[in-house]
């Protein structure tokens, strides 16, 4: 059977008046997966995001994580979307005090 | 102009189901997930799931898991809602509404299902 | 599941009047609050987004504040057309829930 990925989206400052948003994925099988950003509800394009490899985490399980470089300010605008299994999800930025959001999908 | 338009009311059986279709145009079916939402009479408004209409991927509220089943067609640029085993308790209006990332910004006009032996 | 709260479920007033709608939610939702209005028989209309960014074509007499699980729709002077009845809901995490809605009457 599958079992669906825990999701972290975290938050740190990258240069003046812009931040880096990472969005891990990890616990997850089979390795099969979407992670990707979306801006306004539209997934951002290849070059402006940076993806992990998916690699095998020593559980049987695999993880990966993709990134991106934003205005500081517009975080609410984005979401990390993850695929896996025939299941999504969809997983916003935490405000500037939290840095963590953990979900199971299904 | 974003639209989209749901099919028309249904009175059903108890036991029996019911497909709910919402036809989207004005923009790019594909780009943006179609959630589903219902309204029971004088009632509060309550999720049902997502479907991503580009990969069919689905998300569903763990309530509706069991009896709700969302598909989508590409090629006409609709979105479906099927609810099986109704009962009486599901009499309510059914909306879908499209994600703009992190909010509904457009909502059908909604589906009346009437479920009543 | 995130539940939200909201207050009051009705309440009378006249035109010209403050109103403000309040929402808590269960646990915090980090802004992630839009606002609707929903007349009899037709769908819900966005508002406010983001828990303050008022949707397009939104007259600036609504406004939306909060933060954390404490969240406020204010109209500054009610019009005739603002009779209906006002939902929040959180984007934070699914299942995305909505509160019981408020229903403003005219007094």
């Known amino acids: 059977g599958s079992v669906p990925p825990m999701v972290n989206v975290t938050r740190s400052e990258a240069s003046e008046g812009n931040i880096t948003v990472t969005c891990r994925a990890s616990s997850f099988y089979p390795r099969n997966i979407t992670l990707t950003w979306r801006q306004d509800g539209v997934s951002l394009s290849h070059d402006t995001q940076q993806w992990g490899d998916v690699l095998p985490d020593g559980n049987g399980t695999y993880q990966t994580w993709v990134a991106t470089r934003i205005c500081q300010g517009e975080e609410q605008r984005f979401t990390c979307y993850m695929e896996h299994s025939g299941n999504h999800s969809t997983h916003p930025v935490p405000s500037g005090n939290s840095h963590h959001h953990h979900h199971h999908h299904h | 102009e974003v639209q989209l338009v749901q099919s028309g009311a249904e009175v059903k059986k108890p036991g029996s189901s019911v497909k709910v279709s919402c036809k989207a145009s004005?923009?790019?079916?594909?780009?943006?997930?179609i959630e589903w939402v219902r309204q029971a009479p004088g009632q509060g408004l309550e999720w049902i799931g997502a479907?991503?209409?580009?990969?069919?991927?689905?998300n569903y509220n763990e309530k509706f898991k069991d009896r709700a089943t969302l598909t989508a067609d590409k090629s006409t640029n609709t979105a479906y809602m099927e609810l099986s085993s109704l009962r009486s308790e599901d009499t309510a209006v059914y909306f879908c509404?499209?994600?703009?990332?992190?909010?509904?910004?457009?909502w059908g006009q909604g589906t009346l299902v009437t479920v009543s032996s | 599941d995130i539940q939200m709260t909201q207050s009051p479920s009705s309440l009378s007033a006249s035109v010209g009047d403050r109103v403000t709608i309040t929402c808590r939610a269960s646990?915090?939702?980090?802004?992630?609050l839009a606002w609707y209005q929903q007349k009899p028989g037709k769908s819900p209309k966005l508002l406010v987004y983001y828990a303050e960014t008022l949707a397009d074509g939104v007259p600036s007499r609504f406004s939306g504040s909060g933060s954390g699980t404490d969240y406020t729709l204010t109209i500054s002077s009610l019009q005739p057309e603002d009779f209906a009845t006002y939902f929040c809901?959180?984007?934070?995490?699914?299942?995305?829930?909505f509160g019981q809605g408020t229903k403003v009457e005219i007094k």
């Open positions: 509404a499209r994600f703009l990332g992190n909010y509904f910004d457009n």
């Open positions: 004005g923009y790019a079916f594909t780009n943006y997930l």
């Open positions: 646990g915090n939702i980090h802004s992630y």
């Open positions: 479907i991503n209409p580009g990969s069919g991927a689905t």
């Open positions: 809901q959180q984007f934070w995490t699914t299942p995305y829930t």
